[in-house]
């Protein structure tokens, strides 16, 4: 019994004056609480509690279920307790079969004993299966058996409390341990698409997937820089024991331009938080932006190949693409493909392959593209570089020698005189007249140059060379002179093409 200091309130005293009392099933339990300020008796076992306002607690025929802690409390809130075991060979355990354990914490298998004198109070696996090697426990006849530091691997473990009675092992009813996992990492969050592009009035719907070990993970959709609560719908699944998935779907049924912005899916647990964002861009109407990938002014040599290449952004998807030259549409030699296979791709590539270009194929090549909202076009001006071609070389009636050459870039015509029979003409002759003529062909065709010299300046036999050249190459034509006495014979022109 507690010792009492004079003047201080003291706890009640209980008769019989023991901490533990063992009675047989069917016998009487009589407990007396002595205290001038007696208030009540309380009985506790497992989740059950009973009260009694009489200072004497009497149970005429004790049952195993009367096993438990009896506490007497006075008006000062001071109390004293006695633990009563009601020994019943037919019911060695009192059992609360609910068994939950938090990972890494201790949990109590609640199977208190009705007889403290049995031996080997412990846990056993069901159907003779061994317990996990690392499972440690501490038995307490009044409370049950404490499993230390519960592991995730113990989830769904089936076990019994066990004692030895008269040399035989007796098992309690079975317990199934349900382990509540501890959060050892932040939730895993992902979003159905990283960016969305919509026209006004279209529905915006985005799904965030949250994965964690249990359903107690918290998640929400937030709009960056806004406190507005967003409307979201949830679906969730348990894929096995510690694999929980939630899908949080955010919907704006008719998106407006001012709904554009960054939306964040946020999730947290006791370990930490994670988030993922998606960007919404709402445009009032669709668009097409074309970007040339080569210079829009193209110079290419006669007979060579060149690709006219554009990249373009189109939203919504492009519906019609075409390449046009001289009002004719190309049916082949071109291709159009998405820049990436990404579902949210809006960038495309179009290529027109011009092969073995001829001098006559210079001009404006136009790429046109349209979608349901807009049309767009881009033009390439293609110039085909060609070696000069001497179109005419004549002696005119006024005694002039005339040379007309065509090519691109514009040819330069030089004149040379070779006296006698020499093949190499080095003495240059200044032209009397040089003109660039308007070509009858397309504006991107060859440029025509006409140059004339006065043949009366030549007093000796020889050859006059008209040489037309540009960056691509050169071509020559020759006029032969022959004098008989003072008369100049008919001039014979001939050409020699020089690569």
């Amino acid at each position: 019994q507690p010792s009492v200091s004079p003047g201080e309130p003291s706890p009640p005293s209980i008769h019989p004056g023991k901490s533990d009392l063992i009675v047989r099933v069917g016998d009487e339990i009589r407990l007396l609480c002595t205290d001038p300020g007696f208030v009540k008796w309380t009985f506790e076992i497992l989740d059950e509690t009973n009260e009694n306002k009489q200072n004497e607690w009497i149970t005429e025929k004790a049952e195993a279920t009367n096993t438990g802690k009896y506490t007497c409390t006075n008006k000062h809130g001071l109390s004293n307790s006695i633990y009563v075991f009601v020994r019943d060979p037919a019911k060695l355990f009192l059992v609360d079969r609910s068994l939950y354990g938090k990972e890494d914490n201790d949990t109590l298998v609640r199977c208190p004993l009705t007889d403290p004198e049995v031996t080997n109070y412990s846990l056993k696996g069901c159907q003779g299966k061994p317990l996990p090697k690392d499972l440690r426990f501490i038995p307490d006849p009044k409370a049950g058996i404490m499993i230390k530091s519960v592991k995730r691997a113990y989830h769904r473990l089936c076990l019994h409390c066990s004692v030895d009675q008269e040399g035989k092992s007796v098992l309690s009813e079975k317990f199934i341990l349900k382990v509540r996992p501890a959060f050892k990492a932040v939730p895993v969050v992902s979003v159905s698409k990283a960016s969305y592009l919509l026209r006004e009035g279209e529905e915006f719907t985005v799904t965030c997937t949250i994965k964690d070990v249990s359903s107690s993970v918290y998640s929400t959709w937030k709009r960056e820089n806004s406190q507005t609560k967003l409307q979201e719908k949830y679906n969730s699944w348990h894929h096995g024991d510690f694999n929980y998935e939630r899908q949080a779907t955010l919907t704006i049924s008719s998106a407006r331009v001012n709904d554009s912005g960054v939306f964040m899916c946020y999730a947290n647990n006791t370990f930490g938080s994670a988030n993922v964002t998606t960007t919404l861009e709402v445009v009032d109407k669709g668009f097409i932006n074309i970007f040339p990938m080569i210079n829009t002014t193209v110079f290419v040599n006669d007979g060579e190949n060149v690709d006219l290449i554009v990249e373009y952004e189109a939203f919504p998807k492009p519906e019609h693409q075409q390449w046009i030259y001289m009002n004719r549409t190309f049916t082949d030699k071109w291709e159009d493909y998405p820049k990436s296979e990404n579902e949210s791709n809006i960038r495309y590539v179009s290529e027109l392959h011009l092969t073995r270009l001829k001098g006559t194929e210079g001009g404006t090549y136009t790429f046109l593209v349209s979608n349901s909202d807009v049309n767009a076009a881009i033009a390439f001006n293609v110039y085909v570089n060609t070696k000069p071609e001497i179109l005419t070389y004549d002696r005119l009636v006024n005694g002039m020698l005339q040379c007309v050459a065509a090519g691109f870039p514009e040819p330069t015509i030089d004149w040379y005189f070779c006296p006698g029979t020499e093949q190499r003409c080095s003495a240059s002759v200044l032209p009397v007249d040089v003109q660039t003529l308007n070509s009858s062909g397309p504006p991107f065709g060859k440029l025509v140059v006409q140059s004339s010299i006065d043949s009366s300046a030549f007093k000796h036999n020889g050859t006059v060379e008209c040489k037309a050249y540009n960056d691509v190459g050169k071509t020559s034509a020759y006029f032969n002179f022959a004098f008989k006495g003072n008369n100049k014979e008919q001039i014979h022109p001939h050409t020699l093409f020089t690569p």
Epitope: P292, I294, V298, F299, N305, D307, E335, H353
Partner: antibody, heavy 117, light 112 residues
Framework: EVQLQQSGPELVKTGTSVKISCKAS????????MHWVKQSHGKSLEWIGY????????TYNQKFRGKATFTVDTSSSTTYMQFNSLTSEDSAVYFC??????????WGQGTSVTVSS | EVVVTQTPLSLPVSFGDQVSISCRSS???????????LSWYLHKPGQSPQLLIY???NRFSGVPDRFSGSGSGTEFTLEISTIKPEDLGMYYC?????????FGGGTKLEIK
Amino acid sequence: EVQLQQSGPELVKTGTSVKISCKASGYSFSNYYMHWVKQSHGKSLEWIGYISCFNGATTYNQKFRGKATFTVDTSSSTTYMQFNSLTSEDSAVYFCARRTAGAMDYWGQGTSVTVSS
Amino acid sequence: EVVVTQTPLSLPVSFGDQVSISCRSSQSLANSYGNTYLSWYLHKPGQSPQLLIYGISNRFSGVPDRFSGSGSGTEFTLEISTIKPEDLGMYYCLQGTHQPYTFGGGTKLEIK
């Protein structure tokens, strides 16, 4: 005459990076894409990607994304390829090549890169 | 990615022989516009590869007419009508329709 002149051989250390060049002449540089191709010793050719010589836009083979970086200097008609975080697997001959009509019509002479530890 | 398989790996020849090299792709090389970007290259030791044929059958400028290309869809062939010494080397086909572009494994043309 179209010519693609590449920089000389490189001997580099593991973990470093290398930048090789390809100087074009004989044609309108900005009218074409430049592609880069890898040939490991005794192996076939492998396409790395390409760059627009007009505006520097790039496309990479997924396998080389993050490993190769293309740049262009239009004033000198030169394209560059930088290879990062080099390992022995990157030891190879690298070619630049001009592309038209879905084919590579002119090639550089190749640049040998040897990665040593 | 499109896998391009070239056969044979090695082709021993005598000068004057006619030979063909096959190139097979794991999917059709014809795009939705009807274009097929299949080209052939000759790579001689110490030199850069040179384009022979583009667009299945178009000879590149300066390529002798003893070289010809044919095929469609997934099966393509390079033919050399009369082998000359300068034709020896490694031959590669390239598909330029689907990214990433892929080369065949190569065929070594060597003297018997």
